[in-house]
Interface confidence: low
């Protein structure tokens, strides 16, 4: 028997520095976790102790903090090279800055193979990108070889900006011929490494003949065997074993997100490449693991540019941006409108001629808006200003909800109106009218939503049975501020871009902004 140790990360989302336990900015260093310096310490410790080790990343290194905003992927290539990753799969967020924003900083600079079998380039891009990413790579490990085949969510055109010259094929259909090719090359140990979410990971394990192990990402799935070491609740045991359709036991793993854990899986293969045992657990990268001093020094060096960036002007406002709790928790506020408009703008994807856009709606809990921005400072808006408005380091995500769920959410928005509570919703692409004289749970008297399947967008009444796409903070998607109905009833959830980055990009694009209060939220006569 031959033993392989797979170390893996996924959905790191530019958490290069250590973070707090909830993956936001590190405040108390003695209680902080993750970061590439600490990751390197643990990886090196395992490399020294065990003979056959692979370090893999399942995508979405891009997007999530000011590191990505400033360095645009150069930081990913630099520090992944420093950690000597063996391979990476492309995630949807790797396309956030378009194909050029992937090719130049990452694909051309990475010293490790970057993989995806189900992304096919066409047109002029085909020759430009040829060889910069691969469907699979055969890696020598000790005296053996291991095949790594990559895959990426086929929803990427709806979630990011891959352009029109990349075709995202069905993962299973695309993976099978590549795995077959590896088999003909006498590679009998094959890892599928990819970024399509836990459900697809399990399906790949089940349906793609010849795959021995699946290392996934995208769904931020936490798996653990035994008592979990932090706040994350396991979605299943680690590894999660799938019985394939040809009767094999295939381990499937994922390591939560944000570099908080290092996935650690030990696999035993027989001489024909069959998996005969697998075990392990994610390793919590807490402060008991010291940060590697050389990597830490490098981080500090790169950090300097970030501090300068925070105070640079992104754009100007010629109006007061009212982000006060007195406004945003009680009525439509123009800061809420600005943020929602930025959220929709960030999700413009013209993937279908029938639709002007795939999503038109935004909801945002008023309690998530933490500060106004005064226009009397020469109108200047900086990253620092936005960090005061949106201090929680969240993301603006894409969900699919039934109309009935949205109706419940808007009822919840005003169920205890008047107490300055955070659940009051700010909106975009929605016109809502409340009657506060009615009893809680029955206060929404009008709810119109902006059409998507139309050439001239207009507002139509919400249909209870229709499925709508909505952009909202990850906080709401996870049921925060009492929006349990969103968490329980959402039909799909894809994590999006860093909240501050979305708003800063929009302001930079617009240069001068002047959001108004324009009647998105109304109260029927006599009740307010």
């Amino acid at each position: 028997a031959w033993e392989l140790t797979i170390l893996h990360t996924n959905d790191v989302h530019s958490r290069l520095e250590q973070t707090s336990e909830d993956s936001s900015k590190c405040v108390n260093a003695s209680r902080c976790m993750g970061g590439v310096a600490r990751l390197f310490t643990k990886v090196q410790q395992i490399r020294r102790a065990e003979p056959n080790v692979l370090l893999l990343d399942a995508g979405d290194q891009y997007q999530g903090t000011i590191w990505f905003t400033v360095y645009k992927g150069a930081e990913v290539a630099h520090f992944m090279n420093a950690l000597r990753y063996d391979a990476m799969a492309l995630g949807n967020h790797e396309f956030d800055n378009g194909v050029e924003g992937l090719i130049e900083p990452l694909l051309k600079e990475a010293k490790f193979p970057i993989l995806s079998a189900n992304i096919k380039a066409k047109g002029p891009l085909a020759s430009q990108i040829s060889g910069l990413y691969l469907p699979y790579k055969v890696l020598p490990v000790g005296d053996e070889v291991v095949g790594i085949v990559g895959y990426t969510s086929k929803e990427t055109p709806f979630l990011s900006n891959p352009g029109t010259n990349l075709v995202f094929e069905d993962e299973i259909t695309a993976l099978q011929p590549e795995v077959d090719k590896l088999k003909t090359l006498n590679v009998n140990k094959i890892i599928a490494l990819g970024h399509s979410g836990f459900e697809m990971d399990k399906l790949i394990a089940q349906k793609v003949r010849g795959v021995d192990v699946v290392v996934g990402g995208h769904s931020n799935t936490f798996l653990y065997t035994g008592n979990p070491p932090s706040k994350e609740v396991p979605a299943g045991k680690y590894p999660f074993i799938v019985t394939s359709d040809d009767g094999r036991k295939v381990p499937v793993v994922q390591a939560y997100a944000f570099g908080k854990y290092l996935g650690y899986l030990k696999i035993e293969f027989d001489e024909r490449g069959n998996v005969i045992s697998s075990h392990g657990n994610p390793i919590l990268l807490n402060s008991s693991i010291p940060e590697d001093p050389s990597i830490k020094a490098d981080i500090n060096k790169w950090r300097i540019k970030l501090d300068n960036y925070s105070t640079q002007e992104l754009g100007k406002t010629i109006v007061y941006l009212d982000g006060s709790s007195q406004s945003c928790r009680f009525r439509e506020c123009n800061m809420g409108n600005l943020i929602c408009d930025a959220m929709i703008n960030n999700n413009l994807r013209h993937t279908d001629e029938m639709f002007w856009n795939h999503v038109s709606m935004c909801i945002l809990n008023g309690g998530g808006i933490r500060s106004p921005i005064d226009e009397r400072n020469n109108g200047t808006i900086t990253w620092e200003n936005l960090a005061a408005v949106l201090p929680f380091g969240g993301t603006f995500d894409l969900v699919q909800l039934k109309g009935s769920t949205l109706k419940k959410a808007f009822e919840h928005s005003v169920h205890r109106y008047g107490q300055s509570t955070g659940e009051f919703l700010q909106v975009g692409g929605i016109h809502v009218v409340y009657d506060l004289s009615r009893k809680p749970g029955d206060r929404v008297v009008k709810l119109d939503v902006l059409c998507t399947k139309c050439r001239v967008p207009s507002y139509d009444p919400l249909k209870m049975d229709e499925v709508y796409k909505v952009i909202l903070p990850n906080f709401l998607a996870n049921g925060g501020d009492g929006f349990q109905m969103i968490k329980d009833e959402l039909l799909r959830h894809d994590s999006g871009d860093q909240d501050i980055n979305v708003v800063s990009t929009y302001i930079s694009k617009m240069k001068v902004i002047y959001p108004a209060v324009e009647g998105r939220i109304k109260f029927s006569t006599g009740s307010h």
């Epitope: 086929k154 055109p157 094929e169 259909t173 099978q176 077959d180 003949r209």
Partner: antibody, heavy 118, light 107 residues
């Protein structure tokens, strides 16, 4: 329950085009593939192509490439298969089918007879 | 393209008989074979996929076996409603291909 209801029989002249529809109900249309398969009189079944309405991922059998177009209208939960430059050997019953998590052609429409005759 | 060849092309049997239909692939299709039943004027109905997994609602008298190039559909005890045409299909690689069919008739 899962239902796929296809459009009615068509008679076409050689060189013309035909567009067959397949209306899905009883499940979330965007979550499953729709496949198109045809069966000429007394012949074996022949796979034409597929569409994944969730992201409009489409794949065609090379044999039909250039003549077939598969589309989907998500709002109407309907898939379409258009075959152009019809010839007499295209006379067949055209079926749409849906997959499930494990099987390719798990649920079938009732079929649409397309007759190509001058 | 992978060719799927069924045998026999037709066969006569009686109610209660055990019947075996074979399907030979022109190349290794592993366990990626499905079987369908079709009655005149009707759409095919999925019986078995991945060689031996019965689709929902398919009676246990239908079973599949095989791997590589040789696959078999067995009906352990024929019932009156089983007289139909049966097709094998490979879902190992695109283009998906079907056998020419085996017509099962009442003796």
């Amino acid at each position: 329950q899962v239902q796929l209801v296809q459009s009615g029989a068509e008679v076409k002249k050689p060189g013309a085009s035909v567009k067959v529809s397949c209306k899905a109900s009883g499940y979330t249309f965007t979550n499953y593939y729709i496949y198109w398969v045809r069966q000429a009189p007394g012949q074996r079944l022949e796979w034409i192509g597929w569409i994944y309405p969730g992201n409009l991922n489409i794949k065609y059998n090379e044999k039909f490439k250039g003549r077939v177009t598969i589309t989907a209208d998500k709002s109407a939960s309907t898939a379409y298969m258009e075959l152009s430059s019809l010839r007499s050997e295209d006379t067949a019953v055209y079926y749409c089918a849906r997959d499930d998590n494990y099987a390719w052609f798990a649920y079938w429409g009732q079929g649409t007879l397309v007759t190509v005759s001058s | 393209d992978i060719q799927m060849t069924q045998s026999p092309s037709s066969l006569s049997a009686s109610v209660g008989d055990r019947v075996t239909i074979t399907c030979k692939a022109s190349q290794d299709v592993s366990t990626a074979v499905a079987w369908y039943q079709q009655k005149p004027g009707k759409a095919p109905k999925l019986l078995i996929y991945w060689t031996n997994t019965r689709h929902t609602g398919v009676p246990s008298r239908f079973s599949g076996s095989g791997s590589g190039t040789d696959h078999t559909l067995t009906i352990s005890s024929l019932q009156p409603e089983d007289f139909a045409t049966y097709y094998c299909q490979q879902h190992y690689s695109t283009p998906f291909t079907f056998g020419q069919g085996t017509k099962l008739e009442i003796k």
